[in-house]
């Protein structure tokens, strides 16, 4: 659901955190149409996710805590 570097929509699947290695924030006021979290998976895929959904917030927080503790 992305066009060049911008997400145009969100995944309708819930991704398990064990497959995710990192994320990037997409902000609507920085050249893209929507706010999104772009999850980067172990298989080198980029998945656009809705930053308002609780599962997305949980994973972002888990990854942020991992980075902080490194």
């Amino acid at each position: 659901a992305s066009n060049f570097d911008c997400c145009l929509g969100y995944t309708d699947r819930i991704l398990h955190p064990k497959f995710i290695v990192g994320f990037t924030r997409q902000l609507a006021n920085e050249g893209c149409d929507i706010n999104a979290i772009i999850f980067h998976t172990k298989k080198k895929l980029s998945v656009c996710a809705n930053p308002k959904q609780t599962w997305v917030k949980y994973i972002v927080r888990l990854l942020s805590k991992k980075v902080k503790n490194m």
Partner: antibody, heavy 121, light 111 residues
Framework: QMQLVQSGAEVRKPGSSVKVSCKAS????????ISWVRQAPGHGLEWVGG????????DYAQNFTGRVTISADKATKTVYMELRSLRYDDTAVYFC??????????????WGQGTMVTVSS | QSVLTQPPSASGTPGQRVTISCSGS????????VNWYQHLPGTAPKLLIY???QRPSGVPDRFSGSKSGTSASLAISGLQSEDEADYYC????????????FGTGTKLTVL
């Protein structure tokens, strides 16, 4: 419609541990987060921690990190909260509450009935 | 340890309109939606408003919520005696201290 049924009241001595359970019925266990929220006498609501059972990954409020463990048994649709090194000020009613993780809101729409934990010597 | 600030008390007479404020910061209310809970002593809290201004089914339209910047408010119109309770705002917090934070709580008295 999901219901959350919690275990009964507990009395513990300072320094000991308590494990409270929250059993879900009436719906699948998928796509939910279960949080624990407490209210001490004369105080407000306080988020203790939560778990997404399908992830089997828990998260805790900074105040409780290292002293609390939240776990889930998917087979019995039960979430547990264990609080260790109990202090007098851990005396509170502990509630479990549900969030639907696939919605774009993080509200607790269903709550357990509460479990009173008393820390007393 | 609440990071959302509410007035400790509010009051009104039956039929009146009362408003309860909730003040936060850019990491919680500023970047996330606000929920409101009603809590009667001896019972479980009840979800009153979610996503700033949405009412779950069964909640009367006398209850309404709004958000502006880093603050939110709950309005109760046509106040009734059964509205006497504690009210809490809550929001996800993007800082690493705790992902879900509650307000300090407001005790509403119906005179």
């Amino acid at each position: 419609q999901m219901q959350l049924v919690q275990s009964g009241a507990e009395v513990r001595k300072p320094g000991s541990s308590v494990k409270v359970s929250c059993k879900a019925s009436g719906d699948t266990f998928n796509n939910f987060a279960i949080s624990w929220v407490r209210q001490a006498p004369g105080h407000g609501l306080e988020w203790v921690g939560g778990i997404i059972p399908v992830f089997n990954t828990a998260d805790y409020a900074q105040n409780f990190t290292g002293r609390v463990t939240i776990s889930a048994d998917k087979a019995t649709k039960t979430v547990y909260m264990e609080l260790r090194s109990l202090r007098y000020d851990d005396t509170a009613v502990y509630f479990c509450a549900r969030t639907k993780i696939e919605l774009d809101n993080d509200a607790f729409d269903i709550w357990g009935q509460g479990t009173m934990v008393t820390v007393s010597s | 340890q609440s990071v959302l600030t509410q007035p400790p008390s509010a009051s009104g007479t039956p039929g009146q309109r009362v408003t309860i404020s909730c003040s936060g910061s850019s990491s919680n209310i500023g970047s996330n939606t606000v929920n409101w809970y009603q809590h009667l002593p001896g019972t479980a809290p009840k979800l009153l408003i979610y996503s700033n201004n949405q009412r779950p089914s069964g909640v009367p339209d006398r209850f309404s919520g709004s958000k502006s910047g880093t603050s939110a408010s709950l309005a109760i119109s046509g106040l009734q005696s059964e509205d006497e309770a504690d009210y809490y705002c809550a929001a996800w917090d993007d800082s690493l201290n705790g992902p879900y934070v509650f307000g300090t709580g407001t005790k509403l008295t119906v005179l």
